[in-house]
């Protein structure tokens, strides 16, 4: 039994890091393998992650981590019984994929303005809380070409757009994702989408 593709990990910079790797043949990850991880810090304890299968030879492990900060570095040991298959390290702050924003809501009761709001996925004492920027994707269910991205580069998790920038009388969907420039993160997954019917009064033509 050998590791074909070494583990690569990403962190949500809050409580979970996800590691994926591939073996050189079909493997029952949960029964044959264990991923041990330990913070390089005074008094830290070793933890064991039981991997799950991710395709025939692929494995994935969700590492639970407390109080993740930028100085943290973890040692990783992949074991098959008594055999050490791979040894490495992982610094969560260098491989961040933020959590997806939540609670996306479209407020249509503001005169001819659409207000989209969502929730920051981090608590205020997490460093990413004040450093997320967002991309809002709006598209028409009727017209695949009517697809647009709005970049929200300010901290407030909201976006105002004129309803008239979208077509009236049809349904739209929106979703939002986040990233943080400070840690050079990847984009988060998209939030669940929300749907609304866009209608507004056409301006009266003289």
């Amino acid at each position: 039994m050998k590791v074909l593709q070494e583990p690569t990990c990403v962190s949500d910079y809050m409580s979970i890091s996800t590691c994926e790797w591939k073996m050189n043949g079909p493997t029952n990850c949960s029964t044959e393998l264990r991923l041990l991880y330990q913070l390089v810090f005074l008094l830290s304890e070793a933890h064991t992650c039981i991997p799950e299968n991710n395709g025939g030879a692929g494995c994935v492990c969700h590492l639970l981590m407390d109080d993740v900060v930028s100085a943290d570095n973890y040692t990783l040991d992949l074991w098959a019984g008594q055999q050490l298959l791979w040894k490495g390290s992982f610094k969560p702050s260098e491989h961040v994929k933020p959590r997806a924003p939540g609670n996306l809501t479209v407020h249509t009761n503001v005169s001819d303005t659409l207000l989209l709001t969502w929730s920051n996925p981090y608590p205020p004492d997490n460093y990413l809380y004040n450093h997320l920027t967002y991309a809002v994707n709006i598209w028409s269910e009727n017209d695949p070409a009517d697809f647009r991205i709005y970049n929200v580069t300010y901290l407030e998790p909201s976006l105002r757009i004129a309803a008239s920038t979208l077509k009236s009388g049809i349904s739209y969907r929106a979703r939002v994702r986040a990233w943080a420039q400070c840690y050079n993160t990847t984009w988060s997954e998209w939030s669940p989408s929300t749907k609304w019917h866009n209608s507004y009064r056409e301006p009266f033509e003289q």
Partner: antibody, heavy 116, light 111 residues
Framework: QVQLVQSGAEVKKPGASVKVSCKAS????????MHWARQAPGQGLEWMGI????????SYAQKFQGRVTMTRDTSTSTVYMELSSLRSEDTAVYYC?????????WGKGTLVTVSS | QSVLTQPPSVSAAPGQKVTISCSGG????????VSWYQQLPGTAPKLLIY???KRPSGIPDRFSGSKSGTSATLAITGLQTGDEADYYC????????????FGTGTKLTVL
């Protein structure tokens, strides 16, 4: 919100022991390390030791080795710092502080006065 | 007692900029992250900067930190009377068992 509430001021005789408590609230108690530091009047900060509330393991500064004991009670989310064989130089404000490499949350401090 | 050296005092007028230095060695600042704490009279220290240059939520951007080699610097711009306090740098020392160490402290006076 995170709160670290420390016990009240103490006056002790030389040679006695003191036990200072630090009750945590507003977060998962066992998920965060707790440090103890002290500050003598008009002096700087001095690290004393650290406890991992999850398993109760500890590490102490060499200067306090053999005189300090840090414990925790997970049922009340409280950590304790006991310092024995007190001398006048131990007169200081004692702080608990939450964190690993740096400390974002501090208790208000407990003044321990050692005087005959 | 302190492994890190800071100037005992600095002063400047309101609105001005002031810098506080923190000098260490290869076994501490040179090998670890630096944090800075503000201690107002009669209160517990408060985290101002961590990870050399990052500010916790709620700390204004008038406060900034930097690190170069075995020394670190705290800069405060647009000085306010409320900034008058003691300032401490902190890091980890790995010369023996790893342990946190603090600077000697700097008293900031806003003239």
């Amino acid at each position: 919100q995170v709160q670290l509430v420390q016990s009240g001021a103490e006056v002790k005789k030389p040679g006695a022991s003191v036990k200072v408590s630090c009750k945590a609230s507003g977060y998962a108690f066992t998920s965060y390390y707790m440090h103890w530091a002290r500050q003598a009047p008009g002096q700087g900060l001095e690290w004393m030791g650290i406890i991992n509330p999850s398993g109760g393991s500890t590490s102490y500064a060499q200067k306090f080795q053999g005189r300090v004991t840090m414990t925790r009670d997970t049922s009340t989310s409280t950590v304790y710092m006991e310092l024995s064989s007190l001398r006048s130089e131990d007169t200081a404000v004692y702080y608990c502080a939450r964190g690993k490499w740096w400390w974002q949350h501090w208790g208000k401090g407990t003044l321990v006065t050692v005087s005959s | 007692q302190s492994v890190l050296t800071q100037p005992p005092s600095v002063s400047a007028a309101p609105g001005q900029k002031v810098t506080i230095s923190c000098s260490g060695g290869s076994s501490n600042i040179g090998n670890s992250y630096v944090s800075w704490y503000q201690q107002l009279p009669g209160t517990a220290p408060k985290l101002l900067i961590y990870d050399n240059n990052k500010r916790p939520s709620g700390i204004p951007d008038r406060f900034s930190g930097s690190k170069s080699g075995t020394s670190a610097t705290l800069a405060i711009t647009g000085l306010q009377t409320g900034d008058e306090a003691d300032y401490y740098c902190g890091t980890w020392d790995t010369s023996t068992t790893p342990m946190p160490v603090f600077g000697t402290g700097t008293k900031l006076t806003v003239l």
